[in-house]
């Protein structure tokens, strides 16, 4: 007995599509072996039509695909544009066609519905609109027009030209009589329900000379599209419901027990707590289409999702809908990285962001998720040398360590930095990841002076005190600019006296600027790293002024404490040109991120997602 299982009989109609699911024992070998769909010949052979290794027969070109779902031990063969020629006996199987690991499937495609017995067939998706056209003769032009639905043996009046509307259709049906030139009336039914399906009769006149027309209304539930994404990765649901619902509230919901569909996000401002910080509903286009991006995919995100339109912002009978079945692949190509990073006020964080290592040349971005309205993620920094103005001197995106990971360093932390941040690139959109920054109680580990003033032509020495916990780390000074932080020579001055209960392993490392010039003005960072992995940093702003008295400047921590607040220095900053694009459509198109910039400073949410993967600001 073969361990492969599937549907023994599949029946469909011409022009339709089928999705045939074949089940196999999900052993390691089976997961990775060839999957195939073949047609059995009269003489016993089985000719491959499509396989998981990329082969597609010319008979199936452009209308079929085979998708393997190793997590579930299934593969699915989708065949569209069916014709009666597709009727026959098939096998779905694993390995080689002639071996026994297969299951026999009978596919029968019958003739599509036509104008049989003068019946017009209307095939419409659930929630959409149908227009039933009813012709009549001149003698019935002034007579009553009506539409009936056949319920069992009895016709039940649905609507007529005298104003009657059956209660089941209230608010979603109308009868239109065309201009005098056209001998036609139409009945338009909106927000179609499954219960609307059936036989209808339209009639003009009530006597034996009345004109009658039969209609068969078929209401289809939408085919769920199978979506298969990696754990920790990202998914985008593109929802196109048609221009007729362009001004109706939109929603994405996830089916839970039974037929309940819990709202994930909607355009009325509702968002499920489980998706805080990792979801965006993109502004909709004029045609009513919109998209929803979810990052940081979790195992529990798998399930059936519906998008739709309804004034309540949630699924109701008659909502036009689109459906997806999301599978989350736990054998993910996306590496684990901390979902929570903790830092202290005044301190720093170093965030590791994964990207697809095949796209090392892609532009890297970091953005701040904002929960207002439908969610947005204005960019803060990119790998091409752009940094949002408010973050100058305290934010840097580094290509290190490379090979599938980049680093974002943010220092001078305040409570306003708490929130959710997204790592992304202009390449593979599935690699968007989310990290939450939490600001916790504590003191920064690195001690530097506040803001420092250097004198033109003189020497300036700036100290950085490293506690003993960083004894094994490499210590450095660098000068910040838009493209990163260029390393500078520094001197180890021996043990630091800035730490209580810290032994000889503490260190004072100084930055020396000889013969200061105007070009030396700017932000300097001291920090620690291990190889290409960065730890904590501390920032100092060095201002440069004209000589007042001779000599060199040696800055101490005591002087630093009295330094003016950093806001005083703002006027001295070079303002980066405003690269903002209003209403940034960051994720509306897969590649649209490339030139999106946003300078607006919005509210920042700080929500505890309860993640178990946490990272302190000073560790990696």
């Amino acid at each position: 007995k073969s361990p492969i299982f599937g549907p023994e009989e599949v029946n469909s109609v011409e022009g339709n599509s089928v999705s045939i699911t074949c089940y196999y024992p999900p052993t390691s070998v089976n997961r990775h072996t060839r999957k195939y769909w073949c047609r059995q010949g009269a003489r016993g052979g089985c000719i491959t039509l499509i396989s998981s290794e990329g082969y597609v027969s010319s008979k199936y070109a452009g209308r079929a695909n085979l998708t393997n779902f190793p997590e579930n031990g299934t593969f699915v063969v989708n065949i569209a544009q069916l014709s009666q020629d597709d009727s026959g006996r098939y096998k779905c199987g694993l390995g080689i066609n002639s071996r026994g690991l297969s299951f026999d499937v009978s596919l029968e495609v019958s003739q599509g519905p036509g104008l049989l017995n003068d019946t017009k067939v209307y095939t419409v998706d659930l929630g959409r609109t149908v227009t039933i056209n009813c012709p009549f003769k001149t003698e019935n032009a002034q007579k009553r027009k009506s539409l009936y639905k056949q319920i069992g043996l009895y016709p039940v009046l649905v609507i007529d030209s005298s104003g009657y509307v059956n209660p089941n259709y209230t608010g979603r049906i109308r009868l239109d009589i065309q201009g005098t030139g056209q001998l036609l009336f139409s009945v338009v039914i909106n927000q179609l329900r499954l219960s609307d399906a059936g036989q209808y009769l339209c009639q003009a006149g009530d006597d034996s000379n009345s004109n009658k027309k039969n209609a068969d209304l078929q209401v289809l539930k939408p085919e769920p599209e199978l979506v298969y994404e990696d754990l920790r990765g990202s998914v985008t649901f593109h929802c196109a419901l048609g221009p007729e619902v362009a001004n109706v509230a939109k929603f994405l919901c996830r089916q839970s027990s039974g037929e309940n569909c819990d709202v994930v996000v909607n355009t009325l401002g509702k968002r499920a707590p489980a998706f805080e910080g990792r979801i965006l509903l993109n502004p909709q286009d004029k045609d009513g289409s919109f998209s929803v991006v979810i990052t940081g995919l979790r195992k529990e995100d798998a399930g059936r999702y519906l998008c739709g339109a309804h004034s309540d912002g949630q699924l109701q009978e008659g909502s036009p809908i689109q459906a997806w079945q999301l599978f989350v692949n736990e054998e993910s190509t996306i590496p684990r990285s901390p979902t929570v990073v903790k830092g202290v006020a005044g301190g720093s964080v170093a965030v590791l962001c994964p990207y697809n290592r095949k796209e090392s040349k892609s532009i890297k971005y970091w953005c701040l998720w904002e929960g207002a309205q439908n969610g947005r993620c204005p960019l803060l920094v990119d790998s091409e040398g752009w940094v949002k103005a408010q973050y100058e001197g305290r934010l840097s995106l580094l290509e290190e360590p490379g090979n599938g990971t980049f680093t974002v360093i943010l220092n001078q932390l305040t409570s306003r930095d708490a929130g959710f941040y997204w790592c992304l690139t202009n390449g593979d959109t599935l690699w968007r990841t989310t990290v939450e920054i939490k600001i916790i109680e504590g003191e920064p580990n690195l001690k530097v002076p506040g803001n420092v003033t250097a004198v033109l032509g003189e020497t300036l020495k700036v100290p950085c005190h490293f506690p003993c916990k960083f004894s094994s780390y490499e210590k450095y000074w660098c000068k910040w600019n838009n493209t990163g932080c260029q390393a500078l020579p520094s001197q180890d001055e021996g043990p630091s006296k800035a730490f209580v209960n810290c032994d000889e392993n503490s260190r004072l490392v100084s930055l020396t600027l000889n013969l200061v010039t105007r070009a030396d003005e700017g932000w300097y960072w001291c920090g620690v790293k291990q190889g290409h992995f960065y730890g904590e940093t501390a920032a100092v702003y060095v201002a440069v002024e004209e000589r007042k008295a001779a000599g060199s400047r040696d800055v101490s921590l005591a002087k630093a404490d009295a330094a003016p607040d950093e806001k005083v220095l703002d006027s001295g900053f070079r303002e980066i040109e405003n690269k903002a694009i209003q209403d940034p459509r960051l994720f509306a198109e897969e590649k649209a991120v490339a030139d999106t910039r946003d300078q607006a400073d919005g509210s920042r949410a700080s929500v505890d997602s309860g993640s178990s993967e946490e990272q302190g600001g000073s560790s990696r």
Partner: nanobody, 127 residues
Framework: EVQLVESGGGVVQAEDSLRLSCAAS????????MGWFRQVPGKEREFVAA??????????YYDDSVKGRFTVSGDNAKNTLDLQMKGLKPEDTAVYYC??????????????????WGQGTQVTVSS
Amino acid sequence: EVQLVESGGGVVQAEDSLRLSCAASGLPFSSSRMGWFRQVPGKEREFVAAIGWSGRSTYRYYDDSVKGRFTVSGDNAKNTLDLQMKGLKPEDTAVYYCAADPNYYGDVRTSGTYQYWGQGTQVTVSS
């Protein structure tokens, strides 16, 4: 409240035929998949047959033990399910349960896939 009600069970002779029916009510939307399972005392519920609807396509699944003898049919708009059983054998004796799965996902043969269940109808085949 969702209800699935089976009917048509009874006592028959080996090689006789029987038709089981199941009517579902209270499902907010029509079910995407319905199935028949059976259980004998002291054993786990086992898959018999299932039918799935998607768009205008119908998919029928059978356990090897009933292939060629049992035929599953139904109407997803009306949420009805039938099981025509021919050539019945004593080993077909069991309580037969009707099940509905609105979501169409998960293995058709696994009872845990189905969210709604009937109370069962007894089928006894005597030799």
